[in-house]
Each structure stands twice: as C-alpha cells, then as structure tokens.
C-alpha cells in the first residue's frame, strides 16, 4: 500500500489551531508537476457534506513530502469529509478523515467502520441532545433510511445493513430532521472487496495474517499496518510517538501522538494512534491495553509487562506477541518484511536463524507462494546464528505473494513470512519527442509513458543514421531532462530510442519504438548586400541586391525581404523563392512612411546573415478629396461640374480626375482629367439625354488623392444619342456667363 | 419506474374485514415510511395510517385507531392495511404512498383502491 | 389534533390570471405543510414541500409562502392544464391533517 497517512489535529476548543497533515513516506512523493512524482493534494471535499462557505482554507508545503491545512476559523469549518491523495499512477491513492462536530444532536459512537463482504455492518449514533422527531440516515448524501425517534435502544439510533457489498462504501450520516446538517453523525463504511482473510481478483488468496489490528488489502494482499506498527504482518511495535510504514514519521509536539487521528489508506480507515483512544484521541489505554484506539488487550504470559505502545514486554528468555514462545525455540533473525527483484532475475535470499540447539544448514527452508520448497545452497555458520543462503531459480510474475522462511529443529519451529514483490521493467509506449533540431544536434525529451513497473532509475537513449546498419550510438540520461544529441550530420535522418531502467539487478527494460529524427540542412552563410532600391509609387518600393561570389554551389533556397516600420512596430516579410533572383518588387506599403530594409539568405528554415540595413522614405500619399462637388444638367447632352479646392493641401494639385457612370450601369466608369487644377468647374459634354449619371473627383500631387462625394444628375430632353462624353472646362465665373 | 400498485378493495358491509395491499417497485421499499390516506366520494383527503421502514413503529388517525393495522413485509415489497370493523364511513378510495426520503411529503402515490361499506 | 383551514373551497379564474390559494394552521407548524393538486379521477400530486421547496418537473409558476401559521400558495400565470383541486397537508404531528381542498376552475 501506498505510504500516506492525514493526521487530524483534534484541539477543539479552538479551531484556529486545528490542523490537518498529509504525510508521504514514499520515495520522490509530492516533487510537483513533472511526470515521475506528482503533488500531495490535501482538500476539504464538500461533494456530500456542504458547510457555510468561509475563508478559504490555508495550504502549506513543508518539503516534498508534507502538506498542511489550516485557516479553520470557526468550529463548523471543520465538519466535513477531508482527502489527501498521494502516489503516482496506478498507485494514486486517497486518504480520506471524517470530521464530526462534537456539539452535533447525534454522535458516532465509531467512525470508521471497515468490514468485509457479505459482512453485516452497524452504525450507531448515540444521542448527544435529543430532539423528539425522525432521524433520517443518509448514504453519500442521498436519503438512504428513517427511524422514527421512539426507535432508539439505549440512546443509540442504529443503522444494520446486512450482507453488505464493495458500493455500500462511503459516507453515512445521521441527522434529525429538521436539524442543521452540521448536527449529523457523520460515519466512514469501508467494505473490503473481499470475504474476511481473502484477497485477490477473485479472492482467492489468503491474506498473511495481519497482526496488532493491521487490515488486509484486498487489491494487493498487504497489510495496512495501524499507526505504530510495522512489518508485513505489522508485526513489529514503533518506538513510541513514531508512526509510518517504516516507523520513520514521528508525531509532532511534546505530547507525542495525543490528540491525533491517524487515517492510512483504504481498508484501514482513521484511528487514534498507537496507546490513545476516546472521540479526540486524548485518552491514554486503560492497563492491559495497547495499540491503535486501545483496541487490543495484552494477556502477556511468563512475567511479561502490558506497554500501550507496543504490547507484551517479555523478559530474557522468552518471545512472541504474548510471550508464549521460549528462546530456546528456534527464531528467525532480521527477515526484511519486504523484498523487490525484477522479472527474470535469479536472486539470491539470505535467511538467518538463531535456537538451542543451534540451527544448521538443512534445518533452513524458504517456501514460494506456490508451495514450492527451496533448500539452501550454502550456510555461513556464526556465533550467534546460522544464515542459509538459497538460490531463487528465473522469477515470473506468478511468484509475486508472501513467501516464507522456516526453521525447523529439536526445540521447535519458527517461520516469518516476507512479501516477494516481482517488477516488470519499464518499456516505453511510445518513441522519445523532438523538441528542436539544428544542423548538427537534435533536443529529444525521452520522457515517455510506459508499461511495467517504475520508479525510472536511469534512460538510455540510443540512435544512429536510419538503415545503417553501424552500432548504436547510447546515451545515459537523467530522468527528467532533456537531451541534446550532439555532432551530428546534417540533413540526416536518424533512428531514435528509449529504454528504461528500474533499480535492481535485471531492470532494464526493452527498446521503445523508434522514431526518426532528421537534422536541419547547412546553415546559409553568405551575406547579401543592398545595390540599391527606386520607389515607383506611394506604396511601390523596387529592391535590387547582390551576393559575394564563392566557389561551389549556393547554399540556398531564396531570400528573405524584411521592412521594419519603426513608427508603427511592425514587420513586413516578403518572400522571394529563387536562390537566383537578385529583385523583387515590394507593394501594399504604406505611403509617406519611413522602412529600415534588410535581405538575408534562407535555407530549409534556416536563414543566414542579414545584409547591413538600408532606410528608404516613401512618398506621403494624395491630397484630401475635393469639396462641395454640385452636379448641373446643361442640356440633353452637357452636365456641368462646380466644386471647391481640398483643404490643407501637402502642395500643389498637378491635375483632377472626374469619375463618370450611368446610374445603374454595369459598365467600367469613365475617367477624365482636368489638367488645369486652377480651375473649380467644367463641362462634361456628349452625354445621353434623359440619362442619369454619377460623377465624383479627386485631386493628384505626387499620387491620386481621396474620392470626393458621389452626385448625381440627369441630362435633359429627347435629342439624339451623343458619341460619348467629353469634357471642357472653364473658370466658374466664365460657365456661368454662358 | 417507480410504482404503488394497490390491490384488496371491494364492496363490504358494515362490521365486515377487507385486506389492501400495495406492491412497491422501482425504490429501495425497505428503506422508506409508508403511508395509507383515503378519499371519500366527493370529499378531502384523509391521512389513515403511517409505518416506519422496520415496520417497528406505526401511527393511526384517531378514526380507525384499534380497528385498522397498518404492516409490512419488506421482502416482498409489500405493504398491506387490515380493516375490521368497518362501517360506512370508511367508505372511500384508498391510496398508498410513500413518503418521501428526508421529508414527509408524500412523493409517490399509487392509483387507489375502492372500498364501499354498505349493507 | 391540527385543523387546517383552507380558502376558498372553490374559484375561477382566466387563463394568465395570478391565483393565491390560503392555508391557517390552528397551531404553530413551523415550515411543516405540503401543497397538493389532484386531477378528476387521478391521485394527488405533491407540487410545493416544506411550504417553499418546489418539487422537482413543477413549473416554476408556482409557488408557496408562510408567514407564521398562514400559508399560501400562488400560480403566477394560471394555464389550462393547472385545473385540478389543490390541496394543503401539515405533517408537523400526528395525525398528519389536510385542508378541505381548493376547486380551480377555468372561467
């Protein structure tokens, strides 16, 4: 099981010293957001019980593996279900803690309930302050049961739910009705997906035996050990005020682990720590009692002393949990709990063994889950103990499980059971990805997810040109960096890929799929120089350039134009495709603007280096339009023209051009220039009669300025069809004459 | 679907007997308080009878109190009202219902069941 | 036992019109009353529970209030479909009472 406990902090007098921590004993637990060891979350899971909302609550990291929460401002803030989750992958795992109020109408007389398949469960709710009406129980916040308050037995509301199954889990509430939600008893269901001492997908593996109130997983076959205890059967006591898988936790404070609720993961559920009891873990064991909540009784024989800790003290000569067992019967020595070895390696285990008479090499046996007896190979004969040695054949999978030594002589027979745990190397899913490339290097991230077993002590990443058929080029990497293949070809395809390793002897994993990187191509690196440039508009630049000569062929693909408008902050590229063009036409610029111009060689995405930059102004745009623009029918053929000069001209007008076209017409309008741009009026002549024209005008200096206003005008009477319009101007004053 | 199928009226004379039952279906029918309310031709609703989800606590109007018994057998899913005594004022159509979880509304009721007393 | 007044024991109203149905209780009930409509021939409905909640599936043109042991409940715009009798039932103590009902027809 994962190595995560939620310790509550059960000061409740006041609530701002209340605090919840989430400890991870597990290895690299809680370094972040990268892919080997994701965060402790530690949260108040408001899904079923809903509280007032208040301040958010404080969250603190102290290192890696530690999260606290605290910011509790007032005692309903912590009714609730709180979860840390911890672990990685398939291993995430949540721990959940039931927060009771202890002034609520109803209290749980136990909160955690963890019982087996097809087991009968009881909640009890004692009463805390009567209320005369219905007590309705609830299952993960939905309606689940009446009582009706006349039910009560000995002032307890008690919930049975026979024959119960893996989704009867969850939270279970008891609450008057009509009474706050905050005065419920709140209670924790655990049901094993097991029957009891069974474990497995199909539970049918026997369960070790888990001593001192340690519960058997049912996915796994561990045994979550309480706090303060340790061991594969949590057969072993912590030194007081420690807690843990491995006893490397100690409780914060002087007072040790007073006060503490301790929550393991799932089936375990929360308890006091090891020597404490009562609804706040405030109460030391009564005599004769020790462990978790005080739940299991000592019965010590042959003068052994009751610690609430640990248990039986036994005095020289005698052990075992109640001191039953002589030490003159045999007795394995230091078995670790636990062991680890990859897939198809061929271990060797040491058992060591201690007794009067004393043990030899044949009285040792190791047993696999299977049955499977093996004898030792060879014993190292000491003093104080014998220590067999057995040579494990090819590990499968199968021999995953709880493996025992023995030791049989004369003066009895002692054994301890260890789990083997058999892991599959790593092998990548998936192929390494670029993350950049130039001529002679690629950057490759070998992070990959994969199957088997972490953690990932080492990535190599092999590679070489594709279909050579030279070695492999490896490089060893760390986990969690980046890689950078170096002297390479360029413009070269090449094989890449992973292969993962696992701590141990045989770790290594197979190859992952590969996956083919190519370089870039050369970089270009002759500089163009500007020849010159002429502008042929307002928005027209023509750009000419040159090259140094070298010998051999260009190494290009065409050339890259960059304007730079300073004013504006804005970057025109143009692109010319011919590694011969030498010109290019630049259009769409903006008119009166001033560019700084550079050219620069490209090749594949490369570029080389720019040429030293030119600056080029180009002219300012036309004038303003003209204003007042009147139309006035002459005749069946002659429509004249009046308007007034543009305001704030940049200098003087060169000509103005009228625009013509029959109202309505499909065809291209007619343009006409009035050459005199003194003038304010014309004539326009040869039109249709009865016909209905538009006319609008600009003005030209340097360019073609802005359109005037649109009018219209129709020509009178019935005369004879005109060749088309022409036009003749006059002064203003001089058409009006006529 | 959740259902309450009433069945057991009929015509009855005075000082006779009738058992009406309610099949439930579609809910945890364990789990629930149920509940017998009856209409006369014409008239209200009238609440009869209530019983809690053990079927360890009943409760009757003052009307029918020693003459009706309201039980369950929650593993037929079953609930069933005995009528002694009956007069002509019990002459009505009867309804089951559920009250409802939490609350004590009844939230589903079933289509009723006529009993008509009359000599 | 509870009495439970309900007024008027009949009305008529067109379609759109706002309808106010009162309920007294002849004791303090608190939020203890549920709201009722019962179609011809067909069982009754819970529309409004604990004098406010509104049932799941009923529109939201109706409504209920309290002010101390007074009790009503309002269709904001009457439709054709809302005939039926509407009735109130307190489940504040056995015995659980009803009010006589309300006849809602459709001018």
């Known amino acids: 099981a994962v190595d995560l406990t939620l310790l509550a902090n059960l000061r409740l007098t006041d609530p701002q010293r209340f605090f919840l921590t989430c400890v991870s004993g597990e290895a690299g637990a809680g370094r972040g957001s990268d892919a080997w060891g994701p965060p402790l979350l530690l949260e108040k899971d408001d899904r079923i019980v809903r509280t007032p909302p208040g301040p958010p609550l404080r969250l603190a990291r102290n290192g890696s593996h530690q999260v606290t929460l605290r910011g509790f401002s007032k005692p309903s803030d912590l009714v609730g279900v709180f979860s840390c989750v911890g672990g990685a992958g398939a291993r995430r795992t949540r721990v959940i803690y039931v927060h009771n109020s202890p002034g609520a109408h109803l209290l749980p007389d136990k909160v955690t309930h963890t019982v087996n398949k097809g087991d009968t469960a009881v909640l009890s709710a004692r009463v805390h302050k009567e209320k005369q009406t219905d007590v309705i129980w609830k299952s993960n916040g939905s309606y689940f049961y009446t009582l009706d308050w006349h039910e009560a037995q000995d002032g307890r509301f008690l919930l049975q739910l026979p024959n119960v199954q893996p989704p009867s889990s969850g939270i279970y509430s008891a609450t008057y009705l009509e009474a706050s939600p905050l005065g419920s008893a709140f209670f924790r269901l655990i049901v094993r997906g097991c029957g009891a001492g069974r474990w497995g997908p199909g539970c049918t593996k026997e369960c070790p035996g888990c001593l001192h109130g340690g519960v058997c997983h049912d996915h796994d076959g561990e045994c979550v050990c309480p706090p303060g205890f340790t061991g594969t059967r949590c057969e072993q006591a912590c030194r007081e005020g420690r807690f843990g898988q491995s006893c490397q936790e100690q409780c914060p404070g002087i007072s040790g682990c007073r006060g503490l609720t301790f929550c393991l993961p799932d089936p375990y559920g929360c308890s006091c720590g090891s020597g404490w009891r009562g609804s706040q873990c405030q109460e030391a064991c009564a005599p004769g009692h020790f462990g978790a909540d005080c739940r299991l009784q000592c019965q010590c024989q042959n003068g052994g002393t009751c610690d609430r800790f640990s248990g039986c003290v036994c005095p020289s000569g005698w052990h075992g949990v109640h001191c039953e067992k002589s030490d003159r019967i045999p007795q394995i020595l230091n078995m670790a709990s636990e062991l680890e070895f990859n897939l198809e390696t061929m271990p060797r285990i040491n058992c060591a063994a201690a007794g009067n008479p004393f043990p030899v090499r044949g009285s040792i046996e190791l047993r696999k889950p299977d049955g499977t007896v093996l004898l030792s190979t060879k014993a190292i004969v000491e003093p104080e103990k014998t220590t067999a040695e057995f040579e494990v054949p090819r590990l499968v999978l199968a021999d995953s499980g709880f493996w025992e030594c023995r030791v049989s002589t004369s003066g009895g027979q002692d054994s301890r059971r260890f789990k083997v745990n058999v892991k599959v190397p790593p092998v990548p899913l998936a192929a390494p990805r670029l993350l950049t490339k130039q001529s002679r290097q690629l950057v490759v991230s070998p992070l990959v997810s994969f199957s088997g077993d972490g953690p990932i002590s080492t990535v190599r990443l092999h590679y070489r040109p594709q279909d050579s058929t030279m070695d492999w080029s490896t490089i060893v990497v760390d986990p969690s960096e980046n890689v950078t293949l170096m002297n390479l070809r360029p413009k070269t395809g090449y094989s890449v890929r992973v292969q993962l390793s696992r701590p141990g002897e045989g770790g290594e994993g197979a190859w992952g799929p590969p996956t083919l990187m190519t370089t870039d191509c050369p970089e270009p690196l002759l500089q163009p120089w500007l020849e010159g440039w002429h502008v042929e508009g307002t928005d027209r630049l023509r750009v000419s350039w040159s090259l140094p000569l070298v010998p051999g062929p260009l190494v290009g693909d065409g050339f890259l134009l960059r304007l730079w408008d300073g004013t504006r902050g804005q970057e025109r590229r143009e692109n010319v495709s011919s590694p011969q063009a030498r010109t290019a036409l630049l259009t769409g610029l903006t008119p009166g603007t001033h560019y700084q111009l550079d050219v620069q060689l490209y090749h594949c995405t490369l570029l080389g280096p720019a040429s030293p930059p030119a600056h080029v102004l180009l002219p300012p745009s036309g004038p303003p339009a003209p204003r007042h623009l009147h139309a006035q029918a002459l005749s069946d053929s002659e429509i004249q023209l009046t308007w007034k000069h543009p305001e704030a001209l940049p200098g003087p007008i060169s000509k103005y051009v009228v625009e013509v076209q029959v109202a309505g017409g499909a065809g291209d309008p007619l343009w006409i220039d009035v050459d005199r741009p003194e003038e304010t009026s014309t004539i326009i002549r040869g039109l249709n009669a009865s016909t209905r024209y538009l006319f609008r005008m600009r003005a030209s200096i340097q360019g073609l300025g802005d359109w005037s206003n649109t009018v219209e005008e129709s020509t009178l009477g019935n005369g004879l069809q005109a060749e088309g319009p022409v036009q003749e101007s006059r002064a203003a004053e001089e058409g009006l004459d006529q | 679907e959740v259902q309450l199928l009433e069945s057991g009226g009929g015509l009855v004379q005075p000082g006779g007997s009738l058992r009406l039952s309610c099949a439930a279906s579609g809910f945890t029918f364990s789990h629930y308080i149920m509940a017998w309310v009856r209409q006369a031709p014409g008239k209200g609703l009238e609440w009869v009878s209530r019983?809690?989800?053990?079927?360890?606590?009943?409760y009757y109007a003052d009307s029918v109190k020693g003459r009706f018994t309201i039980s369950r057998d929650n593993s037929k899913n079953t609930l069933y009202l005995q009528m002694n005594s009956l007069r002509a004022e019990d002459t009505a159509v009867y309804y089951c219902?559920?009250?409802?979880?939490?609350?004590?509304?009844?939230?589903?009721w079933g289509q009723g069941t006529m009993v008509t007393v009359s000599s | 036992d509870i009495q439970m007044t309900q007024s008027p024991s009949s009305l008529s109203a067109s379609v759109g019109d706002r309808v106010t149905i009162a309920c007294r209780a002849s004791h303090d009930i608190s939020d203890n009353l549920n709201w009722y409509q019962q179609k011809p021939g067909r069982a009754p409905k819970v529309v409004i529970s604990?004098?406010?909640n509104l049932e799941a599936g009923v529109p939201s043109r109706f409504s209920g209030s309290r002010s101390g042991t007074y009790f009503t409940f309002t269709i904001n715009s009457l439709q054709p479909e809302d005939v039926a009798t509407y009735y109130c039932?307190?489940?504040?103590?056995?015995?659980?009472?009803f009010g006589q009902g309300t006849k809602l027809e459709i001018k």
């Open positions: 219902a559920r009250q409802g979880g939490g609350g004590r509304a009844f939230d589903i």
């Open positions: 019983i809690y989800p053990s079927g360890g606590k009943t």
């Open positions: 039932q307190q489940f504040n103590n056995v015995p659980y009472t």
């Open positions: 604990d004098a406010f």
